[in-house]
Amino acid sequence: EEELQVIQPDKSVLVAAGETATLRCTATSLIPVGPIQWFRGAGPGRELIYNQKEGHFPRVTTVSELTKRENMDFSIRIGNITPADAGTYYCVKFRKGSPDDVEFKSGAGTELSVRAKPSAPVVSGPAARATPQHTVSFTCESHGFSPRDITLKWFKNGNELSDFQTNVDPVGESVSYSIHSTAKVVLTREDVHSQVICEVAHVTLQGDPLRGTANLSETIRVPPTLEVTQQPVRAENQVNVTCQVRKFYPQRLQLTWLENGNVSRTETASTVTENKDGTYNWMSWLLVNVSAHRDDVKLTCQVEHDGQPAVSKSHDLKVSAHPKEQGSNTAAENTGSNERNIY
């Protein structure tokens, strides 16, 4: 009778993560009697995957009934495959020996490759907000994919970005890989509603790439522009001074009125109007009793926006002049305001 041969017909097997791998092995003879064992890798450090004789291998099932005496099919199935299962698997026939069974013949090996999907890309922006015209960096990370080949693209509002650097780690062979990319984005005043998108394409995704997004509203700070104007009111001894705070983002804003450098009133922006570009407008009024002042009054609107150093705009109120003669151009400007916070 010809000497037993161990046949592993598949040189390689490709399996998607989470699926079951079938590793085929047959023997050409029943003799010499002895068990089959499956190993991952070769040499002294090889890992036992299945032992026909003893042990508990919860993820492994045999294709045929190995307790049948006439069985020569030693194929196994390994369930719930992960990238860590990748490697070369050997079906090894032992003959019975004492005290231990003796390795008799090995199959040629089957290389198990695992296709694993990348994790959903996570996009993160800078820790602190930045103002328009500044360049900010966004990072995109995705992990656990195999094989190594992967494509990553960056978009801002649908427009592909070109200023980015991407690394796939590790450089050498591994069971799975990670991708890390950093893109540079120049902020504009119109970016409150903008999105930065990181798109990852991989063979496991069947042409349906994964996307991670970051809203520039989390990153941008648009500082306000201030305008202080004076309007007459019916009462002859009163003047209405308005401070228009325009085109700011985010909404967090505190306004302080100063009369000749002394704090008159402080308020926090609450009822604001939103512009189409996502920025906000707000208006504050100060009613000044002119008769209470003998000298000219310097009115200052001081705004602290989003924890930044305060910006201010001043207006000189001439007490000597008649109130109605001052700021005659301002009433028309205010008619378009949605908010009338009159104090």
Partner: antibody
Amino acid sequence: QVQLVQSGAEVKKPGASVKVSCKASGYTFGGYGISWVRQAPGQGLEWMGWISAYGGETNYAQKLQGRVTMTTDTSTSTAYMELRSLRSDDTAVYYCAREAGSSWYDFDLWGRGTLVTVSS
Amino acid sequence: DIQMTQSPSSVSASVGDRVTITCRASQGISSWLAWYQQKPGKAPKLLIYAASNLQSGVPSRFSGSGSGTDFTLTISSLQPEDFATYYCQQGASFPITFGGGTKVEIK
């Protein structure tokens, strides 16, 4: 025809030795192990030991260690069991059996048995 | 060593009866258990191997079950030629050990 043919009955005196043969035919002798099992009159089965017909490795029952030797001759497809320093309680029928399990030990083919009587 | 305890040691039954013999191992032996039938003056004959596999040529009225430590041999309908002594044997590891035997006698 697949069979194991054993040598004939033996009568031995205490302290003597006996060598029982077991000739295999009809199958590849080197592919299987051979175990020796004995049965004293009116008693159950007692495993004595095992030999690989392929590599010659052996494993003996503790109580017989030092008194028993099992060998094979692959050229004649014959297994031998020698038991030394015989005692009266060694009186038994001695069977050779082919061990056929792949991951386990069981015996699918038996010789007819050799009666060994130890008596002064 | 692994001890094999067989019960009962003897059973009286009639032709057509269902007979059950049990065997308990002193430690787990997976499915590596065999059952043999022996008639007076004859060598044992293998009936069941690996706990539940019927040896080629053995009638299907014989069946085996069990795993770990507890095993059963069942003769579904006893025939005249089945009156004999039955032995279990563990084949998991050396030293190989046999149960004490169960004698099936005619009632």
